[in-house]
């Protein structure tokens, strides 16, 4: 789960997730509350929803390890694993490319953003 996600985000965005995204804004990293601060933060909020859905389906999102291929800038999720593994890969692929699409609006000030400042309605899934 987490190891897959970190590797995938680094490959797609070119950034070290632990330095750039975990945490970032109000939703990137563990947990999440309030209104997302920018497009990058929205990526993470959507990813949280993706994980929440898999949890309701009985998937072990942090334990399940999946296989995927990264080539020529694209991610191919393997169809070899279980249903949960395949869906987890799809969630992670989506957030990785979402973060890449929004690199141009990445704000360093939102890195280590103080979570008590995360106010407003938390978006529903």
């Amino acid at each position: 789960g987490i190891l897959n996600l970190n590797k995938m985000v680094k490959q797609v965005t070119g950034k070290m997730p632990i330095l750039s995204y975990w945490p970032y804004g109000c939703h990137c990293g563990l947990g999440g509350r309030g209104q997302p601060k920018d497009a990058t933060d929205w990526c993470c909020q959507t990813h949280d929803c993706c994980y929440d859905h898999l949890k309701t389906q009985g998937c072990s999102i942090y334990k399940d390890y999946y296989r995927y291929n990264f080539s020529q800038g694209n991610i191919h999720c393997s169809d070899k694993g279980s249903w949960c593994e395949q869906q987890l890969c799809a969630c992670d692929k989506e957030v990785a490319f979402c973060l890449k699409r929004n690199l141009d609006t990445y704000q360093k000030r939102l890195r280590f953003y103080w979570r008590p400042h995360c106010r407003g309605q938390t978006p529903g899934c």
Partner: antibody, heavy 120, light 106 residues
Framework: QVTLKESGPGILQSSQTLSLTCSFS??????????VSWIRQPSGKGLEWLAH???????RYNPSLKSRLTISKDTSRNQVFLKITSVDTTDTATYYC????????????WGTGTTVTVSS | QIVLTQSPAIMSASPGEKVTISCSAS?????MYWYQQQPGSSPKPWIY???NLASGVPARFSGSGSGTSYSLTISSMEAEDAATYYC?????????FGAGTKLELK
């Protein structure tokens, strides 16, 4: 027509290594998406999945038996192999190989099975 | 791992009778697969992705369910349906089978 056929020693002694062969025709294990699995069934009991091997030589094992299992393949000869080390009487069963249905996770074609008896 | 519990373990039905075999999963799964095994034969694929009949399976068979509860139904029992039926999941690793339901002709 897709067919699979298992072969094995029939009878072996406790603590020995069981070697099984699955010979198949009608498909190639070099085709992307293909996989062959081993499944066993003790007499009068249910089915237990043992291992998969994929077209790209990736392998998966049942965690409860992983330390004793080795799955391998010879793509050019259309064969898949399974080795089980340190067998005992609880490994007495009919052993099946089966092909994964393309793009799904069920077994669309099964072999006829080979009966293995482990004597103490 | 996900444990699949089939019920009943053994049942008998008369020709023409409706039959329902249940498979309960220890945690939620998205798809269930079913196999039929006649005595002395290897299992045959019977139902895939919960409700799709495998090639050659008579239309009197159907599959349904969601979450932790799945079933295989025969609308009208025939002599050739006497067999053992197994459910299977690969929602999460490892792939597991139910213990089977033996269906006998009354």
């Amino acid at each position: 027509q897709v067919t699979l056929k298992e072969s094995g020693p029939g009878i072996l002694q406790s603590s020995q290594t069981l070697s099984l062969t699955c010979s198949f025709s009608g498909f190639s294990l070099s085709t992307s998406g293909m996989a062959v699995s081993w499944i066993r069934q003790p007499s009068g009991k249910g089915l237990e999945w043992l291992a998969h091997i994929y077209w790209d030589d990736d392998k998966r094992y049942n965690p409860s038996l992983k330390s004793r299992l080795t799955i391998s393949k010879d793509t050019s000869r259309n064969q898949v192999f399974l080795k089980i080390t340190s067998v005992d009487t609880t490994d007495t069963a009919t052993y099946y190989c089966a092909r994964r249905g393309p793009g799904t996770w069920y077994f669309d074609v099964w072999g006829t099975g080979t009966t293995v008896t482990v004597s103490s | 791992q996900i444990v699949l519990t089939q019920s009943p373990a053994i049942m008998s039905a008369s020709p023409g009778e409706k039959v329902t075999i249940s498979c309960s999963a220890s945690s939620s799964v998205v798809y269930m697969y079913w196999y039929q095994q006649q005595p002395g034969s290897s299992p045959k694929p019977w139902i895939y992705r919960t409700s799709n009949l495998a090639s050659g399976v008579p239309a009197r068979f159907s599959g349904s369910g969601s979450g932790t509860s799945y079933s295989l139904t025969i609308s009208s029992m025939e002599a050739e349906d006497a067999a053992t039926y197994y459910c299977q999941q690969y929602h999460s690793s490892p792939l597991t089978f139910g213990a089977g339901t033996k269906l006998e002709l009354k």
